[in-house]
Protein backbone atom coordinates (compact mmCIF):
# COMPACT_ATOMS: atom_id res chain seq x y z
CA UNK A 1 0.00 0.00 0.00
CA UNK A 2 1.07 3.53 -0.61
CA UNK A 3 0.55 6.02 2.17
CA UNK A 4 -3.08 7.14 2.44
CA UNK A 5 -3.49 9.99 4.85
CA UNK A 6 -0.59 8.70 6.89
CA UNK A 7 -2.38 5.58 8.14
CA UNK A 8 -1.14 2.86 5.78
CA UNK A 9 2.44 1.66 5.73
CA UNK A 10 4.66 3.98 3.72
CA UNK A 11 5.57 2.76 0.26
CA UNK A 12 7.25 4.25 -2.78
CA UNK A 13 6.15 7.79 -3.53
CA UNK A 14 4.30 7.98 -6.88
CA UNK A 15 6.27 9.96 -9.49
CA UNK A 16 3.45 12.50 -9.76
CA UNK A 17 3.63 13.15 -6.01
CA UNK A 18 7.42 13.48 -6.05
CA UNK A 19 7.29 15.94 -8.92
CA UNK A 20 4.54 17.95 -7.27
CA UNK A 21 6.55 18.13 -4.05
CA UNK A 22 9.64 19.30 -5.94
CA UNK A 23 7.58 21.99 -7.67
CA UNK A 24 6.12 23.08 -4.32
CA UNK A 25 9.60 23.35 -2.84
CA UNK A 26 10.84 25.47 -5.76
CA UNK A 27 7.75 27.70 -5.46
CA UNK A 28 8.49 28.05 -1.76
CA UNK A 29 12.08 29.07 -2.49
CA UNK A 30 11.10 31.70 -5.08
CA UNK A 31 8.31 33.16 -2.93
CA UNK A 32 10.35 33.35 0.28
CA UNK A 33 13.35 34.91 -1.38
CA UNK A 34 14.22 38.18 0.34
CA UNK A 35 17.99 38.51 -0.02
CA UNK A 36 19.57 37.16 -3.24
CA UNK A 37 19.29 33.37 -3.18
CA UNK A 38 22.53 31.73 -2.03
CA UNK A 39 24.14 35.20 -1.93
CA UNK A 40 24.19 35.41 -5.72
CA UNK A 41 26.09 32.14 -6.22
CA UNK A 42 26.44 31.17 -9.86
CA UNK A 43 25.98 27.67 -11.25
CA UNK A 44 26.16 26.06 -14.69
CA UNK A 45 22.91 26.38 -16.58
CA UNK A 46 21.45 23.16 -17.92
CA UNK A 47 19.67 21.88 -20.98
CA UNK A 48 16.12 21.23 -19.78
CA UNK A 49 15.72 18.01 -21.76
CA UNK A 50 17.08 14.48 -21.37
CA UNK A 51 18.85 13.83 -18.08
CA UNK A 52 17.56 17.12 -16.70
CA UNK A 53 17.25 15.99 -13.07
CA UNK A 54 20.80 14.66 -12.86
CA UNK A 55 22.12 17.75 -14.66
CA UNK A 56 20.23 20.03 -12.25
CA UNK A 57 21.69 18.14 -9.31
CA UNK A 58 25.18 18.25 -10.83
CA UNK A 59 24.91 22.04 -10.95
CA UNK A 60 23.30 22.67 -7.58
CA UNK A 61 25.34 20.15 -5.59
CA UNK A 62 28.38 22.40 -6.00
CA UNK A 63 26.73 25.13 -3.93
CA UNK A 64 27.49 24.61 -0.26
CA UNK A 65 26.44 26.62 2.75
CA UNK A 66 23.10 27.61 1.22
CA UNK A 67 20.38 26.13 3.43
CA UNK A 68 17.63 27.44 1.14
CA UNK A 69 18.41 24.85 -1.54
CA UNK A 70 19.45 21.88 0.63
CA UNK A 71 15.98 20.30 0.44
CA UNK A 72 15.93 20.79 -3.34
CA UNK A 73 19.31 19.07 -3.61
CA UNK A 74 17.98 16.10 -1.62
CA UNK A 75 14.78 15.92 -3.68
CA UNK A 76 16.65 16.03 -6.99
CA UNK A 77 18.84 13.15 -5.86
CA UNK A 78 15.66 11.06 -5.70
CA UNK A 79 15.04 11.72 -9.41
CA UNK A 80 18.60 10.94 -10.50
CA UNK A 81 19.37 7.22 -10.89
CA UNK A 82 23.08 7.57 -10.13
CA UNK A 83 25.03 9.12 -7.27
CA UNK A 84 26.17 12.67 -7.97
CA UNK A 85 29.16 14.29 -6.26
CA UNK A 86 30.37 17.88 -6.26
CA UNK A 87 32.56 18.64 -9.25
CA UNK A 88 31.12 15.77 -11.26
CA UNK A 89 29.56 16.57 -14.64
CA UNK A 90 28.16 13.99 -17.06
CA UNK A 91 28.84 14.13 -20.77
CA UNK A 92 25.26 15.35 -21.24
CA UNK A 93 25.99 18.42 -19.15
CA UNK A 94 27.33 21.09 -21.51
CA UNK A 95 29.03 23.80 -19.45
CA UNK A 96 28.53 26.89 -21.56
CA UNK A 97 27.15 29.56 -19.25
CA UNK A 98 26.70 30.25 -15.55
CA UNK A 99 23.62 31.89 -14.09
CA UNK A 100 22.58 32.91 -10.60
CA UNK A 101 20.98 30.17 -8.50
CA UNK A 102 17.80 32.26 -8.32
CA UNK A 103 17.47 32.27 -12.12
CA UNK A 104 18.35 28.57 -12.25
CA UNK A 105 15.53 27.78 -9.81
CA UNK A 106 13.03 29.93 -11.75
CA UNK A 107 13.93 28.28 -15.07
CA UNK A 108 13.73 24.80 -13.54
CA UNK A 109 10.39 25.59 -11.90
CA UNK A 110 8.82 26.81 -15.14
CA UNK A 111 9.94 23.66 -16.94
CA UNK A 112 8.77 21.31 -14.19
CA UNK A 113 5.35 22.97 -14.13
CA UNK A 114 5.10 22.37 -17.87
CA UNK A 115 6.05 18.70 -17.44
CA UNK A 116 3.48 18.30 -14.66
CA UNK A 117 0.72 19.81 -16.80
CA UNK A 118 1.66 17.45 -19.63
CA UNK A 119 1.66 14.43 -17.31
CA UNK A 120 5.38 13.70 -17.70
CA UNK A 121 6.21 12.58 -14.18
CA UNK A 122 9.48 10.69 -14.72
Amino acid sequence: LTCLGGFASPGPVPPSTALRELIEELVNITQNQKAPLCNGSMVWSINLTAGMYCAALESLINVSGCSAIEKTQRMLSGFCPHKVSAGQFSSLHVRDTKIEVAQFVKDLLLHLKKLFREGQFN
Epitope: S41, N62, G87
Partner: nanobody, 116 residues
Framework: EVQLLESGGGLVQPGGSLRLSCAAS????????MDWVRQAPGKGLEWVSS????????WYADSVKGRFTISRDNSKNTLYLQMNSLRAEDTAVYYC?????????WGQGTLVTVSS
Amino acid sequence: EVQLLESGGGLVQPGGSLRLSCAASGFTFRDYEMDWVRQAPGKGLEWVSSIGPSGSETWYADSVKGRFTISRDNSKNTLYLQMNSLRAEDTAVYYCAKAYTGFGYWGQGTLVTVSS
Protein backbone atom coordinates in the same frame (compact mmCIF):
# COMPACT_ATOMS: atom_id res chain seq x y z
CA GLU B 1 38.93 33.69 5.97
CA VAL B 2 38.54 33.82 2.19
CA GLN B 3 39.92 37.02 0.70
CA LEU B 4 39.95 38.06 -2.95
CA LEU B 5 41.49 41.32 -4.08
CA GLU B 6 41.00 42.51 -7.65
CA SER B 7 43.16 45.07 -9.42
CA GLY B 8 43.93 46.30 -12.92
CA GLY B 9 40.74 48.13 -13.79
CA GLY B 10 40.65 51.62 -15.24
CA LEU B 11 39.60 53.79 -18.15
CA VAL B 12 40.41 52.49 -21.61
CA GLN B 13 39.43 53.46 -25.15
CA PRO B 14 37.30 51.14 -27.32
CA GLY B 15 39.55 48.54 -28.92
CA GLY B 16 42.02 48.77 -26.05
CA SER B 17 43.23 46.14 -23.61
CA LEU B 18 43.41 45.62 -19.85
CA ARG B 19 44.62 42.82 -17.63
CA LEU B 20 42.77 42.20 -14.39
CA SER B 21 44.38 40.34 -11.50
CA CYS B 22 42.88 38.77 -8.41
CA ALA B 23 45.01 37.84 -5.42
CA ALA B 24 43.47 35.04 -3.38
CA SER B 25 44.11 34.01 0.23
CA GLY B 26 42.42 32.09 3.04
CA PHE B 27 41.75 28.90 1.07
CA THR B 28 43.63 26.34 -1.00
CA PHE B 29 43.44 28.26 -4.27
CA ARG B 30 44.72 25.41 -6.48
CA ASP B 31 41.77 23.19 -5.45
CA TYR B 32 38.99 25.46 -6.67
CA GLU B 33 37.29 26.52 -9.87
CA MET B 34 37.30 30.31 -10.13
CA ASP B 35 35.03 32.81 -11.88
CA TRP B 36 35.04 36.32 -13.23
CA VAL B 37 31.62 37.98 -12.92
CA ARG B 38 30.68 41.53 -13.88
CA GLN B 39 27.97 44.03 -13.13
CA ALA B 40 27.30 46.87 -15.55
CA PRO B 41 25.80 50.11 -14.16
CA GLY B 42 22.16 49.55 -13.27
CA LYS B 43 22.25 45.91 -14.44
CA GLY B 44 22.33 42.49 -12.81
CA LEU B 45 25.27 40.15 -12.40
CA GLU B 46 26.67 38.59 -15.57
CA TRP B 47 29.00 35.62 -15.63
CA VAL B 48 32.09 36.32 -17.76
CA SER B 49 34.43 33.36 -17.50
CA SER B 50 35.48 30.36 -15.40
CA ILE B 51 38.63 28.31 -15.04
CA GLY B 52 39.14 24.83 -13.59
CA PRO B 53 41.45 24.18 -10.62
CA SER B 54 44.46 23.22 -12.75
CA GLY B 55 43.87 25.92 -15.36
CA SER B 56 43.50 23.42 -18.18
CA GLU B 57 39.73 23.93 -18.53
CA THR B 58 38.32 27.35 -19.36
CA TRP B 59 34.86 28.62 -20.22
CA TYR B 60 33.61 31.96 -21.59
CA ALA B 61 30.35 33.81 -22.03
CA ASP B 62 29.47 34.25 -25.70
CA SER B 63 29.75 38.02 -25.28
CA VAL B 64 33.49 37.83 -24.52
CA LYS B 65 34.57 34.70 -26.41
CA GLY B 66 37.62 35.35 -28.57
CA ARG B 67 38.37 38.65 -26.81
CA PHE B 68 38.96 37.70 -23.17
CA THR B 69 41.34 35.10 -21.77
CA ILE B 70 41.16 33.72 -18.25
CA SER B 71 44.23 32.19 -16.63
CA ARG B 72 45.65 31.42 -13.21
CA ASP B 73 49.00 31.01 -11.50
CA ASN B 74 48.52 28.52 -8.67
CA SER B 75 52.03 29.14 -7.37
CA LYS B 76 51.10 32.79 -6.82
CA ASN B 77 47.45 32.21 -5.80
CA THR B 78 46.43 34.63 -8.51
CA LEU B 79 43.65 34.69 -11.11
CA TYR B 80 43.86 36.80 -14.28
CA LEU B 81 41.57 38.12 -16.98
CA GLN B 82 43.20 39.46 -20.13
CA MET B 83 40.68 41.67 -21.92
CA ASN B 84 41.33 42.67 -25.53
CA SER B 85 39.25 44.51 -28.15
CA LEU B 86 37.27 46.18 -25.39
CA ARG B 87 33.85 47.62 -26.18
CA ALA B 88 31.63 50.17 -24.47
CA GLU B 89 29.34 47.34 -23.37
CA ASP B 90 32.21 45.81 -21.38
CA THR B 91 31.99 48.74 -18.96
CA ALA B 92 31.27 47.21 -15.54
CA VAL B 93 32.61 46.35 -12.12
CA TYR B 94 34.48 43.06 -12.47
CA TYR B 95 34.48 40.62 -9.57
CA CYS B 96 36.73 37.67 -8.95
CA ALA B 97 34.81 34.81 -7.31
CA LYS B 98 35.52 31.43 -5.78
CA ALA B 99 33.11 29.34 -7.84
CA TYR B 100 29.74 28.37 -6.33
CA THR B 101 30.06 30.81 -3.43
CA GLY B 102 28.00 33.94 -2.93
CA PHE B 103 29.26 37.48 -2.85
CA GLY B 104 30.18 37.09 0.79
CA TYR B 105 33.27 35.42 -0.69
CA TRP B 106 33.84 37.78 -3.59
CA GLY B 107 36.30 40.62 -3.86
CA GLN B 108 35.28 44.27 -3.78
CA GLY B 109 35.54 44.47 -7.56
CA THR B 110 37.51 46.61 -9.97
CA LEU B 111 35.85 49.12 -12.28
CA VAL B 112 36.50 48.89 -16.01
CA THR B 113 35.30 51.85 -18.07
CA VAL B 114 35.48 51.67 -21.86
CA SER B 115 34.97 55.10 -23.36
CA SER B 116 36.49 57.42 -25.91
